[in-house]
Amino acid sequence: APVLPGEDSKDVAAPHSQPLTSSERIDKHIRYILDGISALRKETCNRSNMCESSKEALAENNLNLPKMAEKDGCFQSGFNEDTCLVKIITGLLEFEVYLEYLQNRFESSEEQARAVQMSTKVLIQFLQKKAKNLDAITTPEPTTNASLLTKLQAQNQWLQDMTTHLILRSFKEFLQSSLRALRQM
């Protein structure tokens, strides 16, 4: 079974002799989720040719996956701690519905998919404690999420495979940008 950061895991940074700071805990947590995404991507790429597909852009247009942009204040250019933190939390909240969609998309990595979902929820809680401007964080409407989930699950097999690939790729990219930004804070 997947191990959460803080427990005994060789996939995350070596344990420190003193307790982890809040920033170190968040860093370790993101890296743990990224390891999980990596395992899920491996299964996805092994079972279909989506990872090399040139039709990505076509499918990507129908998905509204969170993406970092210059205006979000998370890049080195125009870096803004408060704006960036709001973007990271908002983005993670928006990804939750897509992570829910992933739950029935894996056979051998079913537990790993669940671990990524649960760890993301914990990460959001960590980050909300760190954020000063919680009012600026918009939470997606449950009804909107429910209808999006239904729509995604109604796609044909090829589109479902492509959606899975795009969600994992985008989430990985979003988390990596978040990790780089959080290390500046």
């Epitope: 940074a13 070596a14 170190e24 860093d27 890296r31 990224l34 990596s38 990219e173």
Partner: antibody, heavy 123, light 107 residues
């Protein structure tokens, strides 16, 4: 096999511009972070700039910020470094490097390096 | 900015010796440290990433350790082909930075 081939170096006067290119082959270019590293004659390595895969996120060393621009064309498998307002201290061999990929998702490390292109800034 | 202090700047050793190079970061960089080897007239080569992970194809006499602010590269049993300059790199926080280098020569 993985190959990185730099071009565009040369002799330029202070205040001038150059555009370096790095043609990548043997791997899925769009999936990897790419970085420029330079080495002045008889000196150590200096990290110059990195560009990430899909986000368009870039980062620069303080010594080149505002003068250099890193970019990539994933369709052409090419990395670029636009260098403006060049100074004599920019004289160096410029290496194009690929960041570790595959399952290594967070660790920075440059596993493939081009042969380098010489940039000389002198009047 | 995070500063890296590499020491010593040069060292002389005999073949078969165990050689240790250290890299000190001015603040914690977790395990985001890599080590490179550069021989005269050649391009740098990645030896160690993630502070302690051996890059594929690198001889097992090379090892890395440390986390936080203190890191070590060890060559257990120096060979003639190991005579080179070694650099550490922090990839934790922008701007990323290399150490000043350590030149390993024959005694």
């Amino acid at each position: 096999q993985v190959q990185l081939v730099e071009s565009g170096g040369g002799l330029v006067q202070p205040g001038g511009s150059l555009r370096l290119s790095c043609a990548a082959s043997g791997f899925t270019f769009s999936n990897y972070y790419m970085t420029w590293v330079r080495q002045a004659p008889g000196k150590g390595l200096e990290w110059v700039s990195s560009i990430y895969s899909f986000s368009g996120d870039t980062a620069y060393a303080d010594s080149v910020k505002g003068r250099f621009t890193i970019s990539r064309d994933n369709a052409k498998n090419t990395l670029y470094l636009q260098m403006n307002s060049l100074k004599s201290e920019d004289t160096a061999v410029y290496y194009c490097t690929r960041n570790l990929g595959g399952v290594v998702v967070t660790t920075n490390g440059y596993d493939y390096w081009g042969q380098g292109t010489q940039v000389t800034v002198s009047s | 900015d995070i500063q890296l202090t590499q020491s010593p700047s040069s060292l002389s050793a005999s073949l078969g010796d165990s050689v240790t190079i250290t890299c000190q970061a001015s603040q914690s960089i977790s395990d985001e440290l890599s080590w490179y080897q550069q021989k005269p007239g050649q391009t740098p080569k990645l030896l160690i990433y993630g502070a302690s992970k051996l890059q594929t194809g690198v001889p097992s006499r090379f090892s890395g350790s440390g986390s936080g602010t203190s890191f070590t590269l060890t060559i257990s049993g120096l060979e003639a082909e190991d005579l080179a300059t070694y650099y550490c790199l922090q990839g934790y926080r922008w701007p990323f930075m290399f150490g000043q280098g350590t030149k390993v020569e024959l005694k």
